[in-house]
């Protein structure tokens, strides 16, 4: 349906404060080192220009598409080329090829100084003074250091934040009331975050259909009572939604997000059981709730797939009319029989299927090729939780740290040449499996663990891409989507690395480290375990837990010291020196 | 947790009858795909035929179609092989299974519990 003018009909559809709101994420996502000031400055005269077009919607400009409106008002920022180099490149293009530009300049790791959380009073202050402001500065943060964050979501993210400052700012222990609540919106932020960057990584990397085929076996694991017709509306609703936030079109994405769950809720009855609750609730509340909701169970009796996939006779000839169709079907019917697998398992087994019929139905007898297609399937299920089982025995005996100290020397050792704060930052990710999905009954473990690990190995992609230093990283990343956990699970120790030499700065420490916060200070020795394999990637486990445990200890002695910093000098030198011989460096 | 205890094993002649029972304890059936395999002397474990939840689907292996019938009652907890004209070569431990998720009845890997078994031999 065309309209006039689709900037005053995004205006009227999503209201004056959602608009100005996405249009701030927008721009900030695209120019990240903006300062603030300048992002509101640029959102204010877009708003401005809205309303006169929903005024009159013939106005000048105003039948202008959003792209063009948009990027012409992020070409009029004065520093562009001083503060983004070869970006302001991208404004001589026209549009599309002027957006494509400016996505393909968002950076997963903007060298933007760490947010510091202010003292309770001063956050308080500063919320009653100007609460508007207040929330924008928090989508501008949010969005400038994560520019693929889900926009709608975002907006629900802010409203909490809110909530939490109305609710704490009034409290007698504000502080006790407004941090647990913040600290909680960051983590929950953070792992949003990270969720829709691999959405994002598999519609730009990998194409629409592959994003369309997680999307089935995800939905169908989730509405299995479902009829594949209403599942595959629903996939088609969604990769057009998450195309668009992908793509930078925040308006229409946060738009077509509210009329998607405006159907789910007013055809709940053919979708899932389990919607009820989350369709009682306001809008922002409702399309979370509805993107969270639970499996719902599944239908009292389903048949052996063997009769449709396998023994029919037109298996070949129905695979042959619709190719996506039959398969989608397949992953479909497979997906609502197994919550219990990982998504990234289901379109592996789909893949498989596939990969056999292209072959049997090309055979002469393709009935007694395909026959025993789902043998080739046991050791794709067994591989994920036979791997499953034996790391969470690990993380059951060593607990979050020590596991995640395992896990940075098994990758550290794999793949040495990725940056020490990458391969922190992923293998801390990776060892939170253990404390998320090993508590869950082993049918819950596989699609917790696997589909997290896929998130977290997307962060270790996009990070390697920006400054790829790893064949072996780039490989496992680019070849297969489904198969990128297994890619990383079967890379041995990389024996052609050199080496690095021993810098005994890099094992220097101060007492700054005695005010850090338990987190950060395991930081610090995650960092210096990490260094310590670049250096010795032969080391036993038994050298580096001596090691480590030396290193712990001394940073206990020397924080507990009158002098500290004389203690870190003197025992540090020592420290080096010691390990230096354990480790025969 | 299923445990599962099979029974009504034995010795019989060719061409004779049999039928095998499987109680349940620990959970409800009516939640698991229930399947019979079994393992011949030297032999690699085959699948004999499996019933979804509420029986309304029943599969079998082509050596045993029209000859075995599978049957459960879900307030017994109980499932059923019920094996006519039998030959020397159904000589096996047969074995009761559950599963929680089933998309392949055949396939042993998509079954959760087992039981010990319970031996048919076929003999004149």
């Known amino acids: 349906d065309a309209h006039k003018s689709e900037v005053a009909h995004r205006f009227k559809d999503l209201g004056e404060e959602n608009f100005k709101a996405l249009v701030l994420i927008a721009f900030a996502q695209y120019l990240q080192q903006c300062p603030f000031e300048d992002h509101v400055k640029l959102v204010n005269e877009v708003t401005e220009f809205a309303k006169t077009c929903v005024a009159d919607e013939s106005a000048e400009n105003c039948d202008k598409s959003l792209h063009t409106l948009f990027g012409d008002k992020l070409c009029t920022v004065a520093t562009l080329r001083e503060t983004y180099g070869e970006m302001a490149d991208c404004c001589a293009k026209q549009e599309p090829e002027r957006n494509e530009c400016f996505l393909q300049h968002k950076d997963d790791n903007p060298n933007l100084p760490r947010l510091v959380r202010p003292e309770v009073d001063v956050m308080c202050t500063a919320f009653h003074d100007n609460e508007e402001t207040f929330l924008k500065k928090y989508l501008y943060e949010i969005a400038r250091r994560h520019p693929y964050f889900y926009a709608p979501e975002l907006l629900f993210f802010a409203k909490r934040y809110k909530a939490a400052f109305t609710e704490c700012c009034q409290a007698a222990d504000k502080a006790a009331c407004l941090l647990p609540k913040l600290d909680e919106l960051r983590d929950e932020g953070k792992a949003s975050s990270a969720k829709q960057r691999l959405k994002c990584a598999s519609l730009q990397k990998f194409g629409e259909r592959a994003f369309k085929a997680w999307a089935v076996a995800r939905l169908s694991q989730r509405f299995p009572k479902a009829e594949f017709a209403e599942v595959s509306k629903l996939v088609t609703d969604l990769t057009k939604v998450h195309t668009e936030c992908c793509h930078g079109d925040l308006l229409e994405c946060a738009d077509d997000r509210a009329d998607l769950a405006k159907y789910i809720c007013e055809n709940q009855d053919s979708i899932s059981s389990k919607l009820k609750e989350c369709c009682e609730k306001p809008l922002l509340e409702k399309s979370h709730c509805i993107a969270e909701v639970e499996n719902d169970e599944m239908p009292a009796d389903l048949p052996s797939l063997a009769a449709d996939f396998v023994e029919s006779k037109d298996v070949c000839k129905n695979y042959a009319e619709a190719k996506d169709v039959f398969l989608g079907m397949f992953l479909y019917e497979y997906a609502r029989r197994h919550p219990d697998y990982s998504v990234v398992l289901l379109l592996r087994l789909a893949k498989t299927y596939e990969t056999t019929l292209e072959k049997c139905c090309a055979a002469a007898d393709p009935h007694e090729c395909y026959a025993k297609v789902f043998d080739e399937f046991k050791p794709l299920v067994e591989e994920p939780q036979n791997l499953i089982k034996q790391n969470c025995e690990l993380f059951e005996q060593l607990g979050e740290y020590k596991f995640q100290n395992a896990l940075l020397v098994r990758y550290t050792k794999k793949v040495p040449q990725v940056s020490t704060p990458t391969l922190v930052e992923v293998s801390r990710n990776l060892g939170k499996v253990g404390s998320k999905c090993c508590k869950h009954p082993e049918a819950k473990r596989m699609p917790c663990a696997e589909d997290y690990l896929s998130v977290v190995l997307n962060q270790l992609c996009v990070l390697h891409e920006k400054t790829p230093v790893s064949d072996r990283v780039t490989k496992c990343c680019t070849e297969s989507l489904v198969n990128r956990r297994p890619c990383f699970s079967a890379l041995e120790v990389d024996e052609t690395y050199v080496p690095k030499e021993f810098n005994a700065e890099t094992f220097t420490f101060h007492a700054d480290i005695c005010t850090l916060s338990e987190k950060e200070r395991q930081i610090k020795k995650q960092t210096a375990l990490v260094e310590l394999v670049k250096h010795k990637p032969k080391a036993t486990k038994e050298q580096l837990k001596a090691v480590m445990d030396d290193f712990a200890a001394f940073v206990e002695k020397c924080c507990k010291a009158d002098d500290k910093e004389t203690c870190f000098a003197e025992e540090g030198k020592k420290l080096v020196a010691a390990s230096q011989a354990a480790l025969g460096l | 947790e299923v445990q599962l205890v099979e029974s009504g094993g034995g010795v019989v002649q060719p061409g004779g009858s049999l039928r095998l029972s499987c109680a349940a304890s620990?959970?409800?059936?009516?939640?698991?795909?229930m399947g019979w395999f079994r393992r011949a002397p030297g032999k690699e474990r085959e699948f004999v035929a499996a019933?979804?939840?509420?029986?309304?689907?029943?599969y079998y292996a082509d050596s045993v179609k029209g000859r075995f019938t599978i049957s459960r009652d879900n307030s017994k907890n109980t499932v059923y092989l019920q094996m006519n004209s039998l030959r020397p070569e159904d000589t096996a431990l047969y074995y009761c299974?559950?599963?929680?998720?089933?998309?392949?009845?055949?396939?042993?890997?998509?079954?959760?519990?087992w039981g010990q078994g319970t031996l048919v031999t076929v003999s004149s």
């Open positions: 299974a559950a599963g929680r998720y089933s998309a392949w009845y055949s396939q042993s890997y998509e079954y959760d519990y």
């Open positions: 620990g959970s409800t059936i009516s939640s698991y795909v």
């Open positions: 019933i979804s939840r509420s029986g309304g689907y029943t």
